[in-house]
């Protein structure tokens, strides 16, 4: 009876012992220590790490497994050769000894060994499959690791550059704030000085007012005397006229009517013989509507209708559309004549536009446009200019082609922002453009680095706010 027993030896190799009668056959098989048994589970979702150590371990383990597999394969081949050799020898002996029982036993043992060999081969195939699976998994993990590492590196780089940018911005802003603080202190000092000057002025004016009040009282008394004298004179004149009309009625039956003369512009006023600077009443074209304007009868041959004047900051130019339409301010001081009147006037005949400018250093310059007109209100009083000459820049500081007029409540500019609200005043803003003569009035020493001041870029640059400006028009054929 065959006794088949499996045990372990002292060095951990597996022993396969076959007892058959008085003969005992022992086979020593090597144990594959580095192979994971099929019963021990492989955890695929272990925490991924970027540490390169794990990767090196895996590579080493794989190399060990490959070596073991190679050894096993070689061992199997040796075992097969050994069995075949032994079988041959045994067969020869059996044949020689003619022991048939032993032959049967050997065949049985051979069969068992072959079966065991097949079992080992199957196990090795399983191990090989597991190793392949593990290798694939490890490769995927490695790929994931490298991808996430790249991503993290990119993020770190981005963040670092962002931090650097922010730091640069921060230091720039800090410098700006400090500069602004310095400016603020200087401005405060100048404001204090101005306040003191104003207080002196106010006290002076108060004393002047008192004197004037006294003079007014005297003048009022004189005025009543003069009124009486005028009344007496009028009576005398009326009596004389009555007498004259009575004596002349037979000779001339026609009665002369007082002719009401109306002027469209200052050129007409000039041509009628009024050659003195001053305020004159003008009439809208084809209408009885009237408007008061200042006429410059001296500059460049006279006959100029002043449509805008800035000189002292006494008038607020941050006005509504309707105010720019009808005009505002005082014609003898700072004022805007009115877009509607200028539009109607400049569409009747050809006009030239002269813009006269003064800076705070005593310099003067001008820009002359040989053709100027404004579109109607429906077209937002768009400005049209042609033929620039003059000393206030070779390039027009009023953007070409002309833009629509914009005010704080009528945003018709080409900017997503609202230029009029930002830069103050109504103007033919582009986006926002190189000029604005209706900006904030800044006094001397506060007139630089002002984005919302009285600007004429191609003469004084962007941040310079002018001291005085005059816009005047006159017929081209004057």
């Amino acid at each position: 009876y065959n006794n088949f027993r499996k045990s372990m030896d002292s060095i951990g190799k597996k022993q396969y012992q076959v007892q058959h009668g008085s003969c005992s056959y022992t086979f020593l098989l090597p144990e594959m220590d580095n192979c994971r048994s099929s019963s021990s589970p492989y955890v695929s979702n272990a925490v991924q790490r970027d540490a390169p150590l794990e990767y090196d371990d895996s590579v080493q383990r794989l190399q060990v497994l490959e070596n073991i597999m190679e050894n096993n394969t070689q061992w199997l081949m040796k075992l097969e050769n050994y069995i075949q050799d032994n079988m041959k020898k045994e067969m020869v002996e059996i044949q020689q000894n003619a022991v048939q029982n032993q032959t049967a036993v050997m065949i049985e043992i051979g069969t068992n060994l072959l079966n065991q060999t097949a079992e080992q081969t199957r196990k090795l195939t399983d191990v090989e499959a597991q190793v392949l699976n593990q290798t694939t998994r490890l490769e995927l993990q490695l790929l994931e690791h490298s991808l996430s590492t790249n991503k993290l590196e990119k993020q770190i780089l981005d963040q670092t550059s962002e931090i650097n940018k922010l730091q640069d911005k921060n230091s720039f802003l800090e410098k700006k704030v400090l500069a602004m603080e310095d400016k603020h202190i200087i401005q405060l000092q100048s404001i204090k000085e101005e306040k003191d000057q104003l207080q002196v002025l106010v006290s002076k004016q108060n004393s002047i007012i008192e004197e004037l009040e006294k003079k007014i009282v005297t003048a009022t008394v004189n005025n009543s005397v003069l009124q009486k004298q005028q009344h007496d004179l009028m009576e005398t004149v009326n009596n004389l006229l009555t007498m004259m009309s009575t004596s002349n009625s037979a000779k001339d039956p026609t009665v002369a009517k007082e002719e009401q003369i109306s002027f469209r512009d200052c050129a007409e006023v000039f041509k009628s013989g009024h050659t003195t600077n001053g305020i004159y009443t003008l009439t809208f074209p084809n209408s009885t509507e009237e408007i008061k304007a200042y006429c410059d009868m001296e500059a460049g041959g006279g006959g100029w209708t002043i449509i805008q004047r800035r000189e002292d900051g006494s008038v607020d130019f941050q006005r509504t559309w309707k105010e720019y339409k009808v005009g505002f301010g005082n014609p003898s001081g700072e004022y805007w004549l009115g877009n509607e009147f200028v539009s109607q006037l400049t569409n009747q005949q050809r006009y030239v536009l002269k813009i006269h400018l003064k800076d705070w250093e005593g310099n003067e310059a001008y820009s002359l446009y040989e053709h100027f007109y404004l579109s109607s209100e429906e077209l937002n009083y768009r400005i049209h200019l042609k033929g620039l000459t003059g000393t206030a820049g070779k390039i027009s500081s009023i953007s070409q082609p002309g833009n629509d007029f914009s005010t704080k409540d009528g945003d018709n500019d080409k900017c997503i922002c609202k230029c009029s609200q930002m830069l103050t005043g109504g103007w033919w803003f582009d986006a926002c453009g190189p000029s604005n003569l209706n900006g904030m009035y800044y006094p001397q020493r506060q007139n630089t680095n002002k984005f919302n001041g009285i600007k004429w870029y191609y003469w004084k640059g962007s941040g310079y706010s002018l001291k005085a400006t005059t816009m005047m028009i006159r017929p081209a054929d004057f």
Epitope: V326, D409, Q421
Partner: antibody
Framework: QVQLQQSGAELARPGASVKLSCKAS????????INWAKQRTGQGLEWIGE????????YYNEKFKGKATLTADKSSSTAYMQLSSLTSEDSAVYFC????????????WGQSTTLTVSS | ENVLTQSPAIMAASLGQKVTMTCSAS???????LHWYQQKSGASPKPLIH???NLASGVPARFSGSGSGTSYSLTISSVEAEDDATYYC?????????FGAGTKLELK
């Protein structure tokens, strides 16, 4: 379509304050001025003031300075008029009306709010 | 402020009659900023004529406006029953806006 919806009638005690509202719809609220007018029984219209919601600029009739305060909430397209230190003289019908910056005539009016000041 | 004086304060008219009411300003007004409104009893005012002579939308052609400077007028060429209302002129020539006291048109 353009609509100006005014808040309902108000009854207030003398010395108190009241806030009337005018909710605009059917147009861009910030592009038009909102004006307020007062009309006492059997009397004419009196202009109180206006607000331009686009910038928050306000203009008042001198007579109503200190009495009326105009505000506007762009998010809800609503204009408000607060009347303070109420007296019987403030009992009246109040209208809100709008105009565009070019037209300058009141093309749409609210349905009115009646304010009664009584102890 | 620019005071607007409307006359007459009250006027009576028969159906089909032509009526004219006036609005006089204490200082000159731009024709662009003189407007007329109609207010019926218990209702809100309604725009009638804007910019001196332009009819508001939905206003019948029997209404017309004219004028310039300080003198403006509103004319109804042929009065109809639905014209029974108070008519206000309104101006802007610088703040404040002002309204006239109104002309009440009654039908005989």
């Amino acid at each position: 379509q353009v609509q100006l919806q005014q808040s309902g009638a108000e009854l207030a005690r003398p010395g108190a304050s009241v806030k009337l509202s005018c909710k605009a719809s059917g147009y861009t609220f910030t592009d038009y001025y909102i004006n307020w007018a007062k009309q006492r029984t059997g009397q004419g219209l009196e202009w109180i003031g206006e607000i331009y919601p686009g910038s928050g600029d306000t203009y008042y009739n001198e007579k109503f300075k200190g009495k009326a305060t105009l505000t506007a909430d762009k998010s809800s397209s609503t204009a408000y008029m607060q009347l303070s230190s109420l007296t019987s003289e403030d009992s009246a019908v109040y209208f809100c009306a709008r105009y565009g910056y070019k037209g300058v005539y009141f093309d749409y009016w609210g349905q009115s709010t009646t304010l009664t000041v009584s102890s | 402020e620019n005071v607007l004086t409307q006359s007459p304060a009250i006027m009576a008219a028969s159906l089909g009659q032509k009526v004219t009411m006036t609005c006089s300003a204490s200082s000159s007004v731009s024709s662009s900023y003189l407007h007329w409104y109609q207010q019926k009893s218990g209702a809100s005012p309604k725009p009638l004529i804007h910019r001196t002579s332009n009819l508001a939308s939905g206003v019948p052609a029997r209404f017309s406006g004219s004028g310039s400077g300080t003198s403006y007028s509103l004319t109804i060429s042929s009065v109809e029953a639905e014209d029974d209302a108070t008519y206000y002129c309104q101006q802007w020539s610088g703040y404040p806006f002002t309204f006239g006291a109104g002309t009440k048109l009654e039908l005989k």
